[in-house]
Interface confidence: low
């Protein structure tokens, strides 16, 4: 803590300007009025204060606002935000998307820090749900943000927010997360025509049920192998050879390269070999001709 000392004559700050960079830490503490600092926070960012000097400025704000800074100050914190602890941020009530953007901008290019995570958590909880504009902002700064949320947290994402999601935002999502997001995407894009719909829904298909994959197979969508390999195994297993052929279109030839990997491997094991042979790809491992095919639910119980 900086020792309390009287401000030298003539050094009392009338405004926040560049002359303050020449002040020693104790002079800043003694000569800068906290209320003045709060009203002129927008100027701090343009002045090349040292980290030590920023510590002093933060200390002054902490004394002025022991219960947490008002949003008018938070919005203009700039680089001073990097000095905040998660405990400081938990005292804030941030409601403006502009404030959130301003603070995320300060941390741009860096990994999500505990401070940023706390800020986002406070903001989203304050709003009650992850609305489209918030999601748009967060994924712009942190493409992996959506996949960092638990399925429970994702359940508060309204379907209309799905329009803000880009394919790269889902790269690190696991099947449980896609299970939650897929029905929302399906609802969000339901009024689009076939080809436009497939382009939008494609990234979410890791959460799609068998019925929806069957429906897509009737729409000439030509799903690529990368998307097919991300489908839920339990959704792929009931598909017939003809349905997979229609679903993949010209990409069906890629099955050969993936025949030892899930979900292709598991799917092959459920198909009749003579059906697989119709693809002309040399896929092996299907049920030999003449064998009894058990009901799928029975087969699950036996395996």
């Amino acid at each position: 803590e900086v020792e309390k000392t009287a401000c030298p004559s003539g050094k009392k700050a009338r405004e926040i300007d560049e002359s303050l960079i020449f002040y020693k830490k104790w002079e800043l503490e003694a000569c800068v009025d906290a209320a003045l600092l709060a009203t002129q926070m927008d100027r701090v960012n343009a002045i090349p204060f040292t980290y030590e000097q920023l510590d002093v400025l933060k200390h002054k704000l902490d004394e002025l606002y022991p219960q947490g800074y008002p949003e008018s100050v938070i919005q203009h914190l700039g680089y001073l935000f990097l000095k905040m602890s998660p405990e400081d941020i938990r005292k804030w009530n941030v409601t403006s998307l502009e404030t959130l953007k301003a603070l995320l901008e300060v941390n741009k290019g860096h990994e999500m820090s505990p401070q940023v995570a706390t800020l986002i958590d406070r903001f989203v909880k304050g709003r009650g749900q992850l609305d489209k504009d918030t999601l748009d902002t967060l994924t712009a700064f942190y493409p992996g943000y959506l996949c960092s949320l638990s399925p429970e947290e994702l359940s508060s994402v309204p379907p209309s927010s799905i329009w803000a999601v880009r394919p790269q935002d889902l790269d690190t999502c696991d099947p449980r997360q896609l299970d939650v997001l897929y029905p929302k995407a399906r609802l969000a894009f339901q009024n689009m025509n076939g080809s436009e719909y497939f382009v939008k829904i494609q990234s979410f298909l890791g959460g799609a049920p068998t019925e929806d994959l069957k429906a897509l197979s009737q729409q000439n969508v030509s799903m690529d192998l990368a998307t097919f390999m991300k489908l839920r195994t339990d959704a792929v297993l009931p598909l017939t050879v003809a349905e997979v052929q229609k679903l993949l279109g010209p990409h069906v030839e890629g099955l050969k390269a993936e025949e030892r990997h899930r979900p292709v491997r598991d799917w092959i094991l459920r198909q009749r070999q003579d059906d697989l042979d119709t693809l002309g790809l040399g896929l092996q491992g299907g049920i030999p001709n003449g064998y009894l095919v058990l009901d799928l639910s029975m087969q699950e119980a036996l395996s």
Epitope: D131, P151, P159, S161, D179, Y182, P183, L187, A208, D212
Partner: antibody, heavy 119, light 111 residues
Framework: QVQLQESGPGLVKPSQTLSLTCTVS??????????WSWIRQHPGKCLEWIGY???????YTNPSLRDRLKISVDTSKNQFSLKLSSVTAADTAMYYC???????????WGQGTMVTVSS | QSALTQPASVSGSPGQSITISCTGT?????????VSWYQQHPGKAPKLMIY???NRPSGVSNRFSGSKSGNTASLTISGLQAGDEADYFC???????????FGCGTKLTVL
């Protein structure tokens, strides 16, 4: 022909948890085309959407009830359920389960079950 | 209370036409075509009559029609019959809250 049937106690004490189950017959709850919803109708006849569940377990609920509400699904029994905790007299209503299709349309409804909150 | 406004009651004689209005905002009725209408007889569950403003499910009489102008949706019943006497509810998707909202219903009396 898909049919829905609600079941559960008709009387619940204040501060307790209201539990209802909807059984789907004539079709599979695992059909990816539908959301399975709960809607209630207060004595003054206003209808209030409570929330829905997808066969995968994903839920979306009315923000005004979210803190007290849990909707779950049991695909093996072709059922979905509602639990509303800390009930008060304001939760007295006719509770309906319904099937929601594309376009936010409730095309099939159960016959409803009346729940009274009273000590 | 619902954010959708419906008249509490309307009446008409057999053979006549009546119209029930449902007024909302640009974030629900005005902004989207997700407007449905339901009929409810006493002691019964609601029944879907109109969806997406003007579409009729199979099995619903063509005497029932729907339309929309600005922030107001309307249900028109032509050739009124005694069996049409019931409560009628409008329902929309509200983009501001991202969930469905119902009107509080209109009681139709066939004189």
């Amino acid at each position: 022909q898909v049919q829905l049937q609600e079941s559960g106690p008709g009387l619940v004490k204040p501060s307790q948890t209201l539990s209802l189950t909807c059984t789907v017959s004539g079709g599979s709850i695992s059909s990816g085309a539908y959301f399975w919803s709960w809607i209630r109708q207060h004595p003054g006849k206003c209808l209030e959407w409570i929330g829905y569940i997808y066969y995968s377990g994903s839920t979306y609920t009315n923000p005004s009830l979210r803190d007290r509400l849990k909707i779950s699904v049991d695909t093996s029994k072709n059922q979905f359920s509602l639990k509303l905790s800390s009930v008060t007299a304001a939760d007295t209503a006719m509770y309906y389960c319904a099937r929601e299709g594309a376009g936010y349309v409730f095309d099939i409804w159960g016959q409803g079950t009346m729940v009274t909150v009273s000590s | 209370q619902s954010a959708l406004t419906q008249p509490a009651s309307v009446s008409g004689s057999p053979g006549q036409s009546i119209t029930i209005s449902c007024t909302g905002t640009s974030s629900d009725v005005g902004g989207y075509n997700y407007v449905s209408w339901y009929q409810q007889h006493p002691g019964k569950a609601p029944k879907l009559m109109i969806y997406e403003v003007s579409n009729r499910p199979s099995g619903v009489s063509n005497r029932f029609s729907g339309s929309k102008s600005g922030n107001t949706a309307s249900l028109t019943i032509s050739g009124l019959q005694a069996g049409d006497e019931a409560d009628y509810f409008c329902q929309v998707w509200d983009s501001s809250s991202d969930h469905v909202v119902f009107g509080c219903g209109t009681k139709l009396t066939v004189l």
